[in-house]
Amino acid sequence: NIDVCKLGTVTVQPAPVIPLGSAANISCSLNPKQGCSHYPSSNELILLKFVNDVLVENLHGKKVHDHTGHSSTFQVTNLSLGMTLFVCKLNCSNSQKKPPVPVCGVEISVGVAPEPPQNISCVQEGENGTVACSWNSGKVTYLKTNYTLQLSGPNNLTCQKQCFSDNRQNCNRLDLGINLSPDLAESRFIVRVTAINDLGNSSSLPHTFTFLDIVIPLPPWDIRINFLNASGSRGTLQWEDEGQVVLNQLRYQPLNSTSWNMVNATNAKGKYDLRDLRPFTEYEFQISSKLHLSGGSWSNWSESLRTRTPEEEPVGILDIWYMKQDIDYDRQQISLFWKSLNPSEARGKILHYQVTLQEVTKKTTLQNTTRHTSWTRVIPRTGAWTASVSAANSKGASAPTHINIVDLCGTGLLAPHQVSAKSENMDNILVTWQPPKKADSAVREYIVEWRALQPGSITKFPPHWLRIPPDNMSALISENIKPYICYEIRVHALSESQGGCSSIRGDSKHKAPVSGPHITAITEKKERLFISWTHIPFPEQRGCILHYRIYWKERDSTAQPELCEIQYRRSQNSHPISSLQPRVTYVLWMTAVTAAGESPQGNEREFCPQGKAN
């Protein structure tokens, strides 16, 4: 509330703006005929210091000069950077009750002289853009500081623009709002920034540049691609550029890729032929421009053009497998399976597959198209059959893949030996084997086939398989492998016209089963007891069951139970035991064992054999 200083004046020496660390003298003087009373000695002038509108100090003790009742001078030191307010008040000592009356006030600003601006850099975005320069102002001055940007060019012309920094805004960039035109391409320009405030001034070092140094071309626009004769691998990329551009950089990649293909094009004039594209692939294209072959800056990358290359006919061969099942004495069911081509082989959307089954000698041919990756037909059991499958998209079909239909496990001499399955980690199984010992024809390839051992898996799910060259004796299977599931794994050895196979079970991870088998019946036949059970439900097996154990002990006995261990076979659900005494009541139960351990016991059944038991 320093209204109009009616009562007096406040002055500052040496000035109201002082350098950091300096002292100042503040004088407060009453105007004539102003004061508390007709007795000047009762006038007491006090000086109060405010920072951010908060009273921080009464400077009563800092008085250095006093004309009693008329004026007082106070020395202030250790002022902090920024602005400090001082208010002079009149305290009438003969009236204790009245508060001091404001006389006048002054603001003192403490700051530093500006440092020379540094790191000046100027850019003009596009041939028609305007020149904007930025710089590093150095330390904060805490005072209003004016900056003048001066640009000197050809024909002895100098342009300039100003801005200022204070506690509300910072000035370290100026857009001159004027354009350097291409006709000045060879000219040199000098730019400097001058800073000035109440405590001093400083100038940057001159910064010299040419038109080509500072003009960043606008990124190319209106990007499009034209595929020659609807080719999926060749296209002409076209775009619009500023007139002075002499160099372009093109980058393109399939959308799911992590690395760009880069191309430099000189004097492209908005056109470039690409010859190595992948058909039916989503691509992203971007272009950047430069005004000079050696100097200057690249533009920002253009907006992306995203487009898919056209289709081309499929290449590569389908991976085919099959299953044979005899239906009756003269008919068999052939189920053909094949894997989808990968995108680089399919080169388009596969519309259908052309399937052919042919009897070689009688020239019988069954043909069909399907959109699925399997096909089943019933054919005679006689004759030599061959199958072929090809994939078709809108541009054509792949070369057909042929496979001879042979009895896959018909030749014992071709059966691989010492097949083993080891779990490698949670999602794969390492299968190894030895070649057939006495094969009378050369093994052309091995097929490792696997399927989850769950009810109905043969009919519900197609098999998974891997083709292995004849000199390899191992395969790491991972497709559709889940932990705690038991898989039946077959290794087929195929020659030109025969097949042999060996089978094993395996899992990628196992736990002890959740429960034991459920005993459903105990029957006595010919002095032997037959224990019947139901298998553990598939989800509770938790891996491949290696064997079952049947436990028994006399009822109420505290002795250890006896046990009989049975090799697990899926088809078996009963087993005889013959070491129980007649007319003794026994308690029986079963457990199941995986490589991880034994299940809890299943249900208990009591039985008392009647007949003579050995």
Epitope: L157, C159, K161, G177, L180, S181, L184
Partner: nanobody, 125 residues
Amino acid sequence: QVQLQESGGGSVQAGGSLRLSCAVSGRTVSDYAMGWFRQAPGKEREFVAAMSSSETTVYPNSVKGRITISRDNAKNAVYLQMNALKPEDTAVYYCSMGPIVTFQGLARQNEYHYWGQGTQVTVSS
């Protein structure tokens, strides 16, 4: 109709000062580049000062420091403050206006679309 009217010219002793004014009607000064040119008897018209629409000022090095161009958007006027005048500053001073954005263009008279009638400045020694 666009009109530019100069005023403030006259005779002055060497070392003295003058402030020329250019009142504009029919266009807004803040939307255009404004320039001052002068023509001494028997000589070609020469560039003295300009201010772009973005308030960037341009001077030939020969007058830099003695001459200042400014504008008052509220009054739709442009001014030329001339200090430390010399006899060679004697000329007719013209105010001009045009949609110019290039550095060189601000100093080229053929880039300016509108011109005033001029005001005479005479500096005697």
